[in-house]
Interface confidence: low
């Protein structure tokens, strides 16, 4: 084994390097000293390091490590942040288009319903947006509320347009009748199934991306332990104390040190792998009724069909509801 | 059949929705994201090696530093911590992850279970009991064209309308994207509904 070159007799090189880390030279000895107070860079002979320098090296080593970690995760972090933002924006746009489609369907097919229909449609799609963002809203309730609100308007404007104003207090009765008589057939149930499945998947997809960001953020901002700082200092800076400015750590030694420093972080690996594979599984299933783009952009058609279903059965329904709700002022249907 | 509101694209500036030549869909964008994420599947296990390869390490030099002395690069001493008695490397590993790492592992476990719970087996079609008159939603189209609901003559094909432009991604100021700064975690987030999936804490 070759003998180490003698340390710089004046510690000049060490001083000039250390000055870049810490302006002010008072911590660097003029000439090599015994260094008996050192705790990390334990000298085999005279050293150009002091206790204060050692502390600065430790701090710098840990900062270097944090920067290396941040640069390692930069591309991944950007990928997830960018996509989370893009998908969030895109889903909002889908909801907006779906609302516009539905409003256009009412405007072009049922203009007499528009003022109130626009209001109910707006409320429904607001709830959809809130649900995607994570609000505690039940999708079935959202759909029921939409149809409960629409039916009285459909009944009074389309099915029974000649109804006198005095009879317009039957709304509550009509809302009740809507469900009990299944006036829209099974279309509400179909919409519930489609919307709930597609929105659940959408919401968890976004949640997963947000958590991905949080995972990277957490490991990005890890503060490394003092023990790790000592190991890094010994690997990166202790050679300077001997005047060995140009020498680099051995590769195998670096790997051992990094595995020690990052033992905790590497424990994430198993769950990270599972996260990506689980997310892939979810994405592979996001089609047909599990694809909110398909479901929401097609809702106007299903709602249109549901109204056609009501119109097709209008005669029967009007008779039944006429009996049920005729005296709703005295006797509410529900 | 319902009037198809082609004229109702509001956000032409944002998305140039209907006239994108390469027609990048949400669906293809998701798949592209997964493929990119899969290239990072070994991210955490590869970190120690990555950091060593991106910090000064003796590659072509004959001599290298082993923490205590200058040694030949291929000698046994090169991989050994020269200051074994200083503190135990094994001990450092045994301390286990920091609380913050344990927390994030817990959250990953949580999301992984939710993701798998929500993952749907392929090939399922809509519930077929649409109504008394036997309306049913068939199994139609491919990923791009799907039948959504509807009765016999009311059944229409809905073309995926939302088309991406690559610019959408870059129009967003990523510095302002959620998560660019470390988020504070509430002390005790009590989620009172299984569907309340906004943030898992």
């Amino acid at each position: 084994q070759p003998p180490p070159p003698p340390p710089d007799a004046t510690c000049h090189q060490v001083r000039s390097f250390f000055q870049r880390l810490q302006p002010g030279l008072k911590w660097v000895p003029e000439t090599p000293v015994p260094g008996s107070d050192l705790q990390v860079c334990l000298p085999k002979g005279p050293t150009c390091c002091s206790r204060k320098m050692e502390e600065k090296y430790q701090l710098t080593a840990r900062l270097n490590m944090e920067q290396l970690l941040q640069s390692a995760s930069m591309e991944l972090k950007f990928l997830i942040i960018q996509n989370a933002a893009v998908f969030q924006e895109a889903f909002e746009i889908v909801v907006r288009h779906a609302k516009n489609y539905t409003n256009a369907m009412f405007k072009n097919n049922y203009p007499s319903l528009t003022p109130q229909a626009f209001e109910f449609v707006g409320e429904f799609f607001t709830d959809v947006s809130l649900y995607i963002l994570g609000s505690d809203i039940n999708v079935d309730d959202m759909v029921n509320e939409l149809f409960d609100s629409l039916f009285p308007v459909i009944y009074t404007q389309l099915m029974n347009p000649g109804l006198p104003d005095s009879a317009l207090d039957i709304n509550e009765c009509l809302r009740g009748a809507r469900r009990d008589l299944k006036v829209f057939g099974n279309f509400p149930k179909l919409i519930m199934t489609q919307v709930s499945k597609s929105l659940q998947v959408t919401r968890i997809f976004l949640q997963a991306l947000n958590l991905g960001i949080e995972v990277i953020n957490t490991t990005d901002h890890l503060k490394f332990s003092k023990d790790c700082g000592r190991m890094l200092t010994r690997m990166w800076y202790c050679s300077y104390c001997q005047g060995l400015m140009m020498v680099k750590p051995c590769g195998g030694y670096c790997n051992v040190v990094m595995q020690g420093c990052m033992a905790g972080v590497v424990e994430i690996d198993k769950y990270w792998r599972e996260y990506i594979l689980s997310l892939e599984e979810l994405v592979n299933g996001m089609y047909r009724i599990y694809d909110m783009e398909n479901v929401l952009l097609g809702l106007f058609s299903t709602i249109h069909d549901s109204i056609q279903y009501v119109q097709k059965n209008a005669g029967k329904l009007t008779t039944t509801i006429g009996k049920l709700c005729a005296h709703s002022q005295q006797r509410q249907y529900r | 059949s319902a009037y198809y509101p082609e004229d109702l694209f509001i956000d032409k500036k944002v998305l140039k929705v209907a006239h994108v030549e390469h027609e990048e869909t949400l669906s293809s964008r998701r798949r592209e994201l997964i493929q990119k994420l899969k290239s990072f599947i070994s991210f955490y296990s590869a970190l120690p090696g990555y950091i060593c390869s991106h910090s000064p390490v003796a590659e072509n030099d004959t001599l290298c530093w082993n923490g205590q002395e200058l040694v030949e690069r291929y000698s046994q001493k090169a991989a050994r911590n020269g200051m074994k008695n200083q503190f135990n490397l094994h001990e450092l590993k045994m301390k286990g992850p920091e609380p913050v790492v344990s927390q994030i592992i817990d959250k990953l476990k949580h999301i992984n279970q939710l993701l798998r719970t929500m993952s749907m087996p392929k090939g399922r079609v809509l519930d077929k009991n649409l109504d008394e008159e036997g309306f049913e939603s068939g199994d139609c189209g491919d990923d791009e064209d799907e039948c959504i609901g509807g009765s016999g003559d009311g059944m229409i094909k809905v073309k995926n309308q939302l088309r991406f432009l690559a610019e959408l991604a870059y129009d967003l100021d990523v510095d302002d994207a959620p998560g660019n700064s470390q988020q504070a975690t509430p002390k005790d987030n009590e989620i009172s509904t299984f569907h309340n999936l906004g943030n898992v804490h």
């Epitope: - | 476990k109 949580h110 993952s119 569907h195």
Partner: antibody, heavy 124, light 107 residues
Amino acid sequence: EVQLVETGGGLVQPGGSLRLSCAASGFSFSSYAMNWVRQAPGKGLEWVSYITSGGSSRYYADSVKGRFTISRDNAKNSLYLQMNSLRDEDTAVYYCARGTYYYGSGNYFLFDYWGQGTTVTVSS
Amino acid sequence: EIVLTQSPATLSLSPGERATLSCRASQSVSSYLAWYQQKPGQAPRLLIYDASNRATGIPARFSGSGSGTDFTLTISSLEPEDFAVYYCQQRSNWPPTFGQGTKVEIK
């Protein structure tokens, strides 16, 4: 062998408090989500609360929300249920139950192992 | 919340007979339905999960079927130790809910 043993039940007046414990053994406790499920005398089962494997998330049934708090100590392999503002209708046998991982997709609300239960009686 | 309705409330059968227990959900629970067995003074035991999968150590005479809203637990040939209360449970929607139980008693 997986074992779950509940303790801490007893007689308490309405408005009072009680803390139930569940000692787990025979499996890696910190890897599993845990739940409390209760059974009123002569009645069916009712899920009460759930906690993730590391304790970061908790869920509660509406009937106990704001009154009960679930917690765990993975170092002690223990699950807890702090019950405050107890009501007559909280009288039941309380079971601690492990959440499963079937096919890696089983969510926490499928219970593969149960304790023998501890009886809580709320009465004046 | 999803309501699970079990029928019949009581089933009186002899050992060796076939038992068919029904569980109906108030809305679709996909296939996320489980069955538990509970004997007097004991904790429930998981028998079937995800509608048709037998849990570890459960004999082959127990089988489950169904999806959506209608589910069935079948015990092909009753053994003396099978006389107990059986509960169905869904985990599709929050909160998880149980049926009111079906008691299988000796005739």
